[in-house]
Interface confidence: low
């Protein structure tokens, strides 16, 4: 296979589109795209750079041997060997390494903090609405409604622990049965997987990187969706989760202990509480039909209060309003009670940015949402950049081998289970599956971890978050201990059941195949990633929610035909790929349908039309100060990846302006070399291969 795809009659005069490079650098193909090294001959002649518009778009035929896009890239070492360095170079290299490590930890810290703030922002924007979802009485009788409420609430508050704790308090106060709570917990499990999918979107700049990152993130989504697809009907039919967990809860005589350890929060809380502090009880109160809570702000103003108590006679409408430890009596006209009236005295205000602004929750939420997404984006880019510069050569080889290699035969099958344990352990340490899977996403993107290895790590993360919930349940007060423990155990066994369904037998690892499929589509049509996010986490749940409110007949009336069509399409798809001869000629492919119904190409054209005007300013901006601008807008390679840049280049080309911008599928390392940016090895060179 040739290092470069051949151009078959691409242009009448190719020399017009080739520009001689002054430096005598060999054309070195990027290893991430090319694994066959047989044609890697270095010719010290004037190098030609393929200009963007015609480099790949005019290919007439595909190369005969196509590289697997899922193969991990070989991260080339641009540094010189440790042994070849002088003393000054070695010292500099060590300091450079320490500097990188400090920067990496710093950005990781802010990355985790921004996730925390993002959760707060979502709670401010959608928390009250999420709370109101719970106060819908139909949840009791409709498990499907419970499921979508779990999804929507978790998506809106960006925290499965918040939605779970609301469920726990509702079960504890008999507003919800454990049976009705189980589908909500399943939904919360799905909802929590949106965070790392959002994080994956930040890596949209590089196609191959995005392909891996998005697939690595959505493997979590598919696992959760598929688990629910199978286990929700099973639970509705058998109530196995409810029965098993009830037996466990009843067989132990639990004593509520100390609080679950806050490990990562210890470091992040001092910073995040300077940004915003929320009174999360408000969401729970709304969920429990407390009318007064609807007017309360989620933003905490007073952090130190003094409560003074005094007793006084008050009248109450009925005995239902009698407070604890007080006696109710009647004078024949009214019911009286001796009430402890509490006077709350505010002593000290909270020390966060928004304490004195008195802005509405929505405004604070939107501000924080924008800021946290920008910080998240910036940190992610920097983490990827630092990791990219560190993980090269031998270091990369060692790390990749350590993470992705299986145990020797016959214990290879154990590797995945160890990964599950590692994922669970790491999640337990950081106390959040979102944080762990979000940190994993860029590593999958840059090719340090394969999707096959990320999958068990993600499954472990699902387990880890439930062990945290179990610990938190054991630490809860007596009146909520039983319900919170049972719900935490339901969550735990749901994930265990999911793992048993979709992991032990390689054939059943459907989420990996589905995620890779979605990764391929999203790499080709990047808008589809956002489309997927909106459809799966918002539109479908909201539609089901709306139909459920309309009642079972409407839900069944709409749902059955939809499900029937989906099954029909899947069966047809299976037959087309496995045994097409069984089908009539017309049904052997999808060409009998209009193009827009079986291809994303026409949709891509429509979406490009709409997004075009927004891309142009970005590209023009990149022309001026590409490096700085791209870092800020969170798109380190936007000069090369957006359609409008290609169009812009074509326009300039027509006017005789030579433009040097790498094409969509070219790799940054090639273009740097092409532009003569390869420095001579000196003591200041990047040092990674020791």
């Amino acid at each position: 296979m040739a290092p470069w795809p051949e151009l078959g009659d691409a242009q009448p005069n190719p020399s017009k589109y080739l520009e001689g490079a002054t430096s005598q650098q060999p054309i070195t193909p990027d290893k991430s795209k090319e694994t066959n090294k047989t044609d890697n001959t270095e010719v010290p002649v004037t190098k030609f750079e393929l200009l963007p518009t015609y480099s790949t778009a005019t290919l007439i035929e595909e190369p005969t041997e196509v590289d697997d896009p899922w193969n991990l890239p070989t991260l080339q070492d641009s540094g010189i060997k440790w042994s070849e360095r002088d003393a000054k170079g070695k010292i500099l290299c060590v300091f450079q390494g320490i500097g990188r490590l400090i920067l990496l930890l710093g950005f990781l810290y802010f990355f985790v903090c921004s996730l925390d703030v993002l959760s707060s922002a979502f709670q401010l924007v959608g928390g009250k609405m999420a709370g109101q979802f719970f106060s819908n009485s139909s949840i009791m009788s409709n498990p499907l409604l419970g499921l979508v409420i779990g999804v929507l609430v978790t998506v809106f508050v960006q925290s499965s622990s918040t939605s779970t704790s609301i469920v726990v308090s509702m079960v504890a106060s008999s507003l919800l049965t454990v049976r009705a709570a189980i589908p909500i917990i399943m939904g919360a499990n799905i909802g929590t997987s949106i965070t790392n999918t959002i994080v994956a979107l930040m890596q949209v700049g590089d196609r191959s990187e995005f392909r891996r990152a998005f697939a690595g993130a959505t493997v979590h989504d598919f696992f959760n969706w598929l688990s629910v697809l199978v286990l929700l009907p099973v639970e509705v039919a058998t109530h196995y989760l409810e029965v098993v967990t009830q037996l466990i809860v009843e067989s132990f005589h639990f004593k509520n202990g100390e609080d679950a350890p806050d490990l990562l929060k210890v470091i992040t809380k001092p910073f995040t509480k300077l940004i915003v502090q929320l009174d999360k009880k408000v969401i729970s109160q709304i969920a429990m039909n407390d009318e007064t809570a609807k007017n309360k702000s989620l933003v905490k103003i007073w952090c130190k209060t003094f409560t003074n108590m005094t007793q006084m006679n008050v009248t109450v409408p009925s005995m239902a309003n009698c407070t604890s430890h007080s006696l109710c009596w009647t004078d024949g006209i009214q019911i009286w009670t001796m009430k402890n009236v509490t006077y709350k005295e505010n002593i000290a205000k909270c020390q966060h940015i928004f304490v004195n602004f008195h802005l509405p929750d929505l405004a604070v939420g939107i501000i924080l949402l924008i800021i946290s997404l920008l910080v998240l984006c910036g940190c992610l880019i920097m983490i990827v950049k630092i990791l990219g510069s560190v993980l090269k050569g031998q270091v990369a080889t060692v790390i990749k081998k350590t993470i992705n290699t299986d145990f020797p035969f016959p214990f290879a099958w154990l590797t995945g289970y160890l990964a599950i344990l590692v994922g669970a352990g790491m999640t337990f340490i950081v106390q959040s599956s979102s944080v762990f899977t979000s940190a994993l996403t860029p590593l999958i993107g840059i090719g340090v971890i394969t999707i096959e290895r990320a999958y068990p790590l993600t499954l472990g993360s699902n387990i880890g978050t439930t062990t945290t919930a179990i610990l938190a349940a054991l630490a809860s007060p007596g009146n909520t201990l039983r319900s919170s423990l049972q719900i935490a155990l339901c969550h735990f066994f749901f994930n265990i059941s999911g793992i048993l369904l979709w992991y032990p037998i390689p054939f059943t690892r459907l989420p990996i195949r589905m995620a890779k499929g979605l990764g391929n589509i999203s790499a080709k049509y990047r808008w589809f990633a956002v489309f997927y996010l909106i459809i799966f986490f918002f539109l479908i749940p909201l539609t089901v929610f709306g139909l459920s409110l309309a009642g079972w007949p409407v839900l069944v009336g709409v749902g059955v035909p939809v499900v029937f069509i989906i099954i029909l399409v899947l069966c047809l798809r299976l037959l087309q790929s496995r045994c097409p001869r069984v089908l009539p000629k017309k049904l052997q492919n999808w060409n009998f349908l209009p193009l827009c119904m079986h291809s994303l190409k026409p949709w891509d054209a429509v979406i490009s039309k709409f997004t075009g005007p927004f891309q142009m300013p970005c590209c023009c901006c990149c022309r001026v100060c590409c490096r700085v601008c791209c870092l800020l807008c969170g798109c380190p390679k936007c000069c090369r990846c957006s359609k409008c840049c290609q169009d812009l280049e074509e326009g300039q080309e027509a006017q005789g302006v030579p433009v040097k911008a790498p094409e969509t599928f070219d790799n940054i390392t090639i273009s740097r070399e092409a532009q003569g940016e390869v420095r001579a090895p000196d003591s200041k060179t990047e040092c990674t291969a020791l």
């Epitope: 008999s174 007793q311 006679n313 009925s318 005995m319 239902a320 009698c322 407070t323 604890s324 430890h325 007080s326 006696l327 109710c328 009596w329 009647t330 019911i335 009286w336 001796m338 009146n479």
Partner: antibody, heavy 121, light 107 residues
Framework: EVQLVESGGGLVQPGGSLRLSCAAS????????MHWVRQAPGKGLEYVSG????????FYVDSVKGRFTISRDNSKNTLYLQMGSLRAEDMAVYYC??????????????WGQGTMVTVSS | DIQMTQSPSSLSASVGDRVTITCRAS??????LNWYQQKPGKAPKVLIY???SLQSGVPSRFSGSGSGTDFTLTISSLQPEDFATYYC?????????FGQGTRLEIK
Amino acid sequence: EVQLVESGGGLVQPGGSLRLSCAASGFTFSSYVMHWVRQAPGKGLEYVSGVSSSGDSTFYVDSVKGRFTISRDNSKNTLYLQMGSLRAEDMAVYYCARGGITGAPLVFDIWGQGTMVTVSS
Amino acid sequence: DIQMTQSPSSLSASVGDRVTITCRASQSISRFLNWYQQKPGKAPKVLIYVTSSLQSGVPSRFSGSGSGTDFTLTISSLQPEDFATYYCQQSYNTPITFGQGTRLEIK
């Protein structure tokens, strides 16, 4: 151990008086509402009277109003029921009971063993 | 006053049986209904309060349900120690009133 022990019951003539006491131990007596409940031989339970934790609010069932007085001494952890103008229908086992499961103040979670009051000529 | 009516006034059952006792209030008492168990010569003991909350230390075979005016106490699998008299009590309005009791005997 949380405990309530009644005393002061006995035989009394109609129109006579009797003072029942209930000694509490094992819990913060001054935090709880206390009640008297009675049970006539072979009959069901009947609520008699209650007193708030501080002792300044009381409640009586109509049939004993004006004849019985409930009081408490928080320093001694003791509840009292002063019964006067006793009638034959007042003959019962008198139980002292603690009220106040959180959120359910008129639930009697701790009961004494009871003391028998016999009204007979 | 709110009248509480229990049914049946007595019933015979065997060990392992599922038993249901009902209690009806003369007016709506929301969920403010409590259940007590009393054994001969002993003081009553609270089993369930506010319709369905199980008092600590009470076996989970006891459960309560209902709201408004109709309530039930269910013993899922009768044990020898469960043979006693059961009372319902409303704590919604003064004066507090009890049901007349249901005597549960061994068949």
